[in-house]
Amino acid sequence: VVSHFNDCPDSHTQFCFHGTCRFLVQEDKPACVCASGYVGARCEHADLLA
């Protein structure tokens, strides 16, 4: 399935702890693009291997 990404709705501006929230339009779900040094579904963990 090819998904289309856009900025998340305002309701989810704080969804990603250390990263940028992206909206998966077709699935109606948020996803996080983590900042360097962070991992996890919501970029909630420091990457100890970085």
Epitope: N6, D7, C8, P9, D10, S11, H12, F23, V25, E27, D28, K29, P30
Partner: antibody
Amino acid sequence: VQLQESGPGLVKPSQSLSLTCTVTGYSITSDYAWNWIRQFPGNKLEWMGYISYSGSTSYNPSLKSRISITRDTSKNQFFLQLNSVTTEDTATYYCARGGITRFAYWGQGTLVTVSA
Amino acid sequence: DIQMTQTTSSLSASLGDRLTISCRASQDIRNYLNWYQQKPDGTVKLLIYYTSRLHSGVPSRFSGSGSGTDYSLTISNLEQEDIATYFCQQGNTLPWTFGGGTKLEIK
């Protein structure tokens, strides 16, 4: 996925309204948000709240002091409880599966009348 | 809360017509606008999401457009089965809110 609302069609003022949504064809713990929406006489729709697949809840601030949404994962059901009802709570109540912006699948709705 | 306004509460059209239903938000909702169809028996179905995307199984005669605060649903080549009430809903900000509905009738 199919959703089916059930519960009493008549509730007395000051009592609690309790409804059940039975979900078939999809596990409510797998994904998505499981919502309650109501439609007042005259067609106005109001989102009431949801319980997510993880069990977290979010409620409409207009109802926050009176509403509770819970679930029974073993029966794949989720529930609405609305306390201290008045005649203004007379409406058709729908359950619906949603994501973070829309309601993709709805139940058929159940009419609840609040009257003495 | 974001207020959603459908200024036309009822609309009369003939079979085969092309018609447009409008919806206005009280603030920018960034294309997070969905359309629903409610049949006379109360059945509700999602038609269009994120302004212009067709939900699965929805006929291509339905289309959506808009941006910012102003959005519209267009039905081309109106069919008998399209007789229903149409609601818009914003998905940008909690609490999610709906328009008052536009009831479609046949001339």
